[in-house]
């Protein structure tokens, strides 16, 4: 807290400019009008204020907007955003994607902070669903964003948004998340032809049921081992040796190197030794 003191004569700020960096904290408090600050927020980022000075500016905005900042101010917060707490952000109503982008830019290159997580949560809840433009923006800044959502939150992703998802966005998703995303991807890509469909659906196959894997095995897709290893164990187990051979095509030889790992080790145990022997890989059930 900065004590309330009268502004020295001639120091009253007429605009937000570089002269303010020479003001002491108490002078900023006394001489900068909060309403002026709010209207000229876009200038703050161009001025090399110290962290202590930024604290004073935040304090002034907090006093002016005790119920939360308006979007016109939020959009121009810039580095002042880093001073905000999740509690502050929960008071905001952010509806513009441009505002979201501006604030994410401030945090760019850093891990998702609690502030950013709260901001995104407020934004997505305000929109009601995770639309394609929002998802595009969020995954551009945070490739792991999608996998940080709960299955319940992912259920609000419309199938149309799936087009924005890149393979690396799904790297850290667990089976429960892929269980939600896979049916949406299937719907989104349903009108594509065989080989194009497989390229698009491949990253989501960790949520695929057995019957879809059986269907893929009939389409000469030549699934690579990395994708096969990410399939749900319970979806792989009912596949026959012939179906796995068709599914993997020339990559079937890779099963030997993965025989100690799930889901391969589970699948091997459930096969007849005679069937495994047809692969000629020396797999022991």
């Amino acid at each position: 807290e900065v004590e309330k003191t009268a502004c020295p004569s001639g120091k009253k700020a007429r605009e937000i400019d570089e002269s303010l960096i020479f003001y002491k904290k108490w002078e900023l408090e006394a001489c900068v009008d909060a309403a002026l600050l709010a209207t000229q927020m876009d200038r703050v980022n161009a001025i090399p204020f110290t962290y202590e000075q930024l604290d004073v500016l935040k304090h002034k905005l907090d006093e002016l907007y005790p119920q939360g900042y308006p979007e016109s101010v939020i959009q121009h917060l810039g580095y002042l955003f880093l001073k905000m707490s999740p509690e502050d952000i929960r008071k905001w109503n952010v509806t513009s994607l441009e505002t979201l982008k501006a604030l994410l830019e401030v945090n760019k290159g850093h891990e998702m902070s609690p502030q950013v997580a709260t901001l995104i949560d407020r934004f997505v809840k305000g929109r009601g669903q995770l639309d394609k433009d929002t998802l595009d923006t969020l995954t551009a800044f945070y490739p792991g964003y999608l996998c940080s959502l709960s299955p319940e939150e992912l259920s609000s992703v419309p199938p149309s948004s799936i087009w924005a998802v890149r393979p690396q966005d799904l790297d850290t998703c667990d089976p429960r998340q892929l269980d939600v995303l896979y049916p949406k991807a299937r719907l989104a890509f349903q009108n594509m032809n065989g080989s194009e469909y497989f390229v698009k659906i491949q990253s989501f196959l960790g949520g695929a049921p057995t019957e879809d894997l059986k269907a893929l095995s009939q389409q000469n897709v030549s699934m690579d081992l990395a994708t096969f290893m990410k399939l749900r164990t319970d979806a792989v187990l009912p596949l026959t040796v012939a179906e796995v051979q068709k599914l993997l095509g020339p990559h079937v030889e890779g099963l030997k190197a993965e025989e100690r790992h799930r889901p391969v080790r589970d699948w091997i145990l459930r096969q007849r030794q005679d069937d495994l022997d047809t692969l000629g890989l020396g797999l022991q059930g």
Epitope: D174, R176, T233, R260, R262, R265, L269
Partner: antibody, heavy 119, light 107 residues
């Protein structure tokens, strides 16, 4: 309610073979959904997986013990067993039998039986 | 073999505290990591399976997260009955391996 119960001698002499049996009640050892494991815990130490068996008789052992371990299953008695040969004092531990499900976790454990290797 | 390294090996905490235990795998275990609680003289009890799924009957104050090589068990508000030793375990690759354990003691 599936339950597991270990049984076997609590004292084994060095160089002899440790033999334990795990009886499954409330469920079937023949279920294709589970692996049946043995795990041990030396006094005051952590947990060590010994190996598992599938109802078909397929086994998988910890390489550190493989040369001395045999796990077998008797579906008619709804039991699976552990034999550990050439034991030494280092094999003194609480031995647990446990069920591993498709999710890869040991969801059901026996209460454990203490086996001491001493002459 | 995949080595599971748990930290800390022990910690002191008070009732109501938030407690975090971490487990690092020497190579990727994908999401095949489970967490157990063990009390003296008792068998371990499954808390979390597949990195983040809560086992039926386990209180919701327990949660798990992580994938690949780094995993976390969190107890949001420690209760008197939670003082015990906690183990992580990977089931991605044989031999199945456990972490060395974390003993949670009363401060």
């Amino acid at each position: 309610q599936v339950q597991l119960q270990e049984s076997g001698p609590g004292l084994v002499k060095p160089s002899e073979t440790l033999s334990l049996t795990c009886t499954v009640s409330g469920g079937s050892v023949s279920s294709g959904s589970y692996y049946w494991s043995w795990i041990r815990q030396p006094p005051g130490k952590g947990l060590e997986w010994i190996g598992y068996i599938y109802y078909s008789g397929s086994t998988n052992y910890n390489p550190s013990l493989k040369s001395r371990v045999t796990i077998s299953v008797d579906t008619s008695k709804n039991q699976f067993s552990l034999k550990l040969s050439s034991v030494t004092a280092a094999d003194t531990a609480v031995y647990y039998c446990a069920r591993e499900g498709k999710n890869g976790a040991f969801d059901i454990w026996g209460q454990g039986t203490m086996v001491t290797v001493s002459s | 073999d995949i080595q599971m390294t748990q930290s800390p090996s022990s910690l002191s905490a008070s009732v109501g505290d938030r407690v975090t235990i971490t487990c690092r795998a020497s190579q990727s275990s994908r999401y095949y990591v489970n967490w157990y609680q063990q009390k003296p003289g008792k068998a371990p009890k499954l808390l979390i399976y597949a990195a983040s799924s809560l086992q039926s009957g386990v209180p919701s104050r327990f949660s798990g997260s992580g994938s690949g090589t780094d995993f976390t068990l969190t107890i949001s508000s420690l209760q008197p009955e939670d003082f015990a030793t906690y183990y992580c375990q990977q089931s991605y690759s044989t031999p199945l391996t456990f972490g060395g354990g974390t003993k949670v003691e009363i401060k």
